[in-house]
Interface confidence: low
């Protein structure tokens, strides 16, 4: 696993412990919380990042209307079960043996149950809608400039292939970024849209996961783009299964 050889750190994940104990004395980095080796040349999976976060000390519109099946992560942080590749396991449980099923970005997609709950497969989140509201500016941003800057950001900072940024919508002050990535489209080595969205979310909140890099300084034609609210909607390849009680609550 590549890492900065000179001081042995992980450029893409500061929630790691690194030491020169890899083959041939190479720098090897392990995620906090799980101890799993991570590839520092790409983004770390959201599951391992959440686990590391939980182990750390507690300190006619052009806009898209989210589908009725879209999920919002209302459950907040939890300490997830990850598989050996760092993906979320389909079933998650807390310390009181309450369990639920999650999608590939770790968001709950069923009612909560007990240890008998079955989650037969990890359902892929294939469409992510990132809904941002920017702070007031003198005028609206130019849509094509904004589109180009956000696509550049996802390509260069998060290493997400441009084909997975499906669209950028803008209706001042709301910006929507659509990420789409079907199972069949994702090749080996491709960054997952869920991981890219999570890094972006943390960047927007001023909690960058990158080692030693400055915070996110988003500018469109030199004008700072300051986000004051973020909502992320997750759409799964198979619609979630919640009881009617939840849907009518």
């Amino acid at each position: 696993h590549t890492a900065a050889q000179d001081n042995c750190t992980c450029p893409t994940n500061k929630m790691t412990v690194c030491s020169p104990d890899g083959p041939g004395g190479r720098c090897q980095c392990r995620a906090l919380g799980s101890g799993m080796a991570v590839d520092c040349s790409t983004l770390t999976s959201k599951c391992l990042l959440l686990k590391a976060r939980m182990s750390a000390p507690k300190n006619a519109r052009t806009l898209v209307r989210p589908s009725e099946h879209a999920l919002v992560d209302n459950d907040g942080l939890y300490d997830p079960d990850c598989d050996p590749e760092g993906r979320f396991k389909a079933r998650q449980c807390n310390q009181t043996s309450v369990c639920w099923c999650v999608n590939s970005v770790g968001v709950r997609r069923t009612d909560k149950g007990d240890l008998s709950l079955r989650c037969d497969e990890l359902v892929r989140t294939h469409h992510i809608l990132i809904d941002l509201r920017h702070r007031p500016t003198a005028g609206a941003f130019n849509h094509s400039d904004l589109d180009a800057e956000l696509r550049r950001l996802f390509r260069e900072r998060y290493r997400l292939h441009p084909k997975f940024v499906a669209a950028v919508h803008y209706e001042q002050p709301t910006i929507q970024i659509e990420l789409r990535q079907n199972t069949s489209q994702k090749a080996a080595g491709d960054v997952d849209i869920g991981d890219a969205a999570y890094y972006f979310e943390r960047d927007i909140k001023g909690e960058s996961l990158f080692q030693g890099r400055g915070g996110l300084d988003l500018r469109v034609r030199g004008e700072p783009l300051q986000v004051e609210r973020t909502l992320i909607y997750y759409l799964d390849e198979i619609p979630p299964k919640f009881s009617m009680k939840r849907l009518t609550a």
Partner: nanobody, 127 residues
């Protein structure tokens, strides 16, 4: 290389005892819940018992409750299954398996997909 190696199986008379061991190597064992499974000839593999990362939480199949005890020694990277009052229906190949867990206290469910499996050790209960 990740490995789970079972030992301690053998032939025992009904009412006798055996202690199975599962030695873990090649991974950060501190983060793995461990389960024991068994498979009798011609039958499906079934869960016997499982234990959390910390060892503070355990679970048992109804058929072995009160007779089997699971424990772990993280210092020795080993999980044990103490089997007392053995019955002929306990005969089968016993496997240990490891599941990567998000909590020290939650035990893996019997049916969950475990990540790594051992090769198994034969237990035969017969007079």
């Amino acid at each position: 290389e990740v490995q789970l190696v079972e030992s301690g199986g053998g032939l025992v008379q009904p009412g006798g005892s055996l202690r199975l061991s599962c030695a873990l190597s090649g991974f950060t064992k501190d983060y793995y819940g461990i389960g024991w499974f068994r498979q009798a000839p011609g039958k499906e593999r079934e869960g016997v018992s499982c234990i959390s990362v910390s060892g503070s939480s355990t679970n048992y199949a109804d058929s072995v409750k009160g007779r089997f005890t699971i424990s772990r020694d993280n210092a020795k990277n080993t999980v044990y299954l103490q089997m007392n009052s053995l019955k002929p229906e306990d005969t089968g190949v016993y496997y240990c398996a490891a599941a990567f867990m998000g909590s020290d206290y939650v035990v893996p469910e019997m049916s969950r997909e475990y990540d790594y499996w051992g090769q198994g050790t034969q237990v035969t209960v017969s007079s």
